[in-house]
């Protein structure tokens, strides 16, 4: 099922990302540089292990995980979080927890695009990727 996500993806549109980062608690300086970044996302699968790399002028990150198993993650904005990613109806649901807070990132395929929906409390950001 995760095969649909495999490949290299480039960010083509971003909506409400600054407001989402504010709600997450990201500081002004980090928001400024993160908001300017146009990351590529590289997703690969090796057996049970899924790897998601993000590459940009701002920060390069990489996470490798098994669905349903909690792992440690350092996010591009420098949060140290506990993450769990599950597959729910074809949607990769990524929950990050830190400092008593929680945010959910949903990655889903829509037509030829990969749509990433970031939710923190009542604030949602939608970022759309196309194949690079």
């Amino acid at each position: 099922m995760c095969d649909a996500f495999v490949g290299t993806w480039k960010l083509v549109s971003s909506e409400n990302f600054d407001d989402y980062m504010k709600e997450v608690g990201v500081g002004f300086a980090t928001r400024k540089v993160a908001g300017m970044a146009k990351p590529n996302m590289i997703i690969s699968v090796n057996g049970d292990v899924i790897t998601i790399k993000s590459e940009s002028t701002f920060k390069n990150t990489e996470i490798s995980f098994i669905l349903g198993q909690e792992f440690d993650e350092v996010t591009a904005d420098d949060r140290k979080v506990k993450s769990t990613i599950t597959l729910d109806g074809g949607v990769l649901v990524h929950v990050q927890k830190w400092d008593g807070k929680s945010t959910t990132i949903k990655r889903k395929r829509e037509d030829d695009k990969l749509v990433v929906e970031c939710v923190m409390k009542g604030v949602t950001s939608t970022r759309v990727y196309e194949r690079a």
């Epitope: 504010k22 608690g25 990201v26 500081g27 002004f28 300086a29 980090t30 400024k32 540089v33 300017m36 002028t57 701002f58 920060k59 996010t75 904005d77 420098d78 949060r79 400092d99």
Partner: antibody, heavy 119, light 108 residues
């Protein structure tokens, strides 16, 4: 270990310019903002501006926009602040500090450069 | 700009005394972006508490921080001689970055 090295002191004449340096080591220089802070004798801390070495992007305090110019040399992992048209009001200790992402606080500070503007 | 008002500006505490310093913020900020620094004379500031309540490396556990929205505080559960210093709050939630004017804490 993370270090920010600054010269101890600079003495310059009124009307001149000076370029203060801040050499970083112990981490990936391009991954964190570098901030400059001014402290006049017996006074509090005043933010001058930030520079992100990864892109050269800057964020400046409007008050210092015509006074301070921030640059970096990534090849030597050094941040610079040029202060122009110096007056006695510019005599102060100038600190550079590294900004830790997400929280955006200063997790490492240089020792500060004492700038004296005097004829 | 977001103004940070610290109180008191100057205070003295006896060894063992509980100390609370407050930082009032002119408009609401994220608690993740409110920080405290300790500075002793002739030295650079040191990160002391970040993200409202996280102690920086090496800070004694007698220190704590709390708050949200527009009201924040730094507390020392039991004053010690080495705590005598000036404490500054700082925010970088909204442009421009601002510091409080500082609270000078002396040993009585």
């Amino acid at each position: 270990q993370v270090q920010l090295q600054q010269p101890g002191a600079e003495l310059v004449k009124p009307g001149a310019s000076v370029k203060l340096s801040c050499k970083a080591s112990g981490y990936t220089f391009t991954s964190n903002w570098i901030t400059w802070v001014k402290q006049r004798p017996g006074q509090g801390l005043e933010w001058i501006g930030d520079i992100y070495p990864g892109s050269g992007s800057t964020t400046n305090n409007e008050k210092f926009k015509s006074k301070a110019t921030l640059t970096v040399d990534t090849s030597s992992s050094t941040a610079y602040m040029q202060l122009s048209s110096l007056t006695s009001e510019d005599s102060a200790v100038y600190y550079c500090a590294r900004l830790r992402g997400y929280y955006d606080y200063f997790d490492f500070w240089g020792q500060g450069t004492t700038l004296t503007v005097s004829s | 700009e977001v103004v940070l008002t610290q109180s008191p500006a100057l205070m003295a505490a006896s060894p063992g005394e509980k100390v609370t310093i407050t930082c009032s913020v002119s408009s609401s900020i994220s608690s993740s972006n409110l920080h405290w620094y300790q500075q002793k004379s002739e030295t650079s500031p040191k990160p002391w508490i970040y993200g409202t309540s996280n102690l920086a490396s090496g800070v004694p556990v007698r220190f704590s921080g709390s708050g949200s929205g527009t009201s924040y505080s730094l507390t020392i559960s039991s004053m010690e001689a080495e705590d005598a210093a000036t404490y500054y709050c700082q925010q970088w939630s909204h442009y421009p970055l601002t510091f409080g004017a500082g609270t000078k804490l002396e040993l009585k």
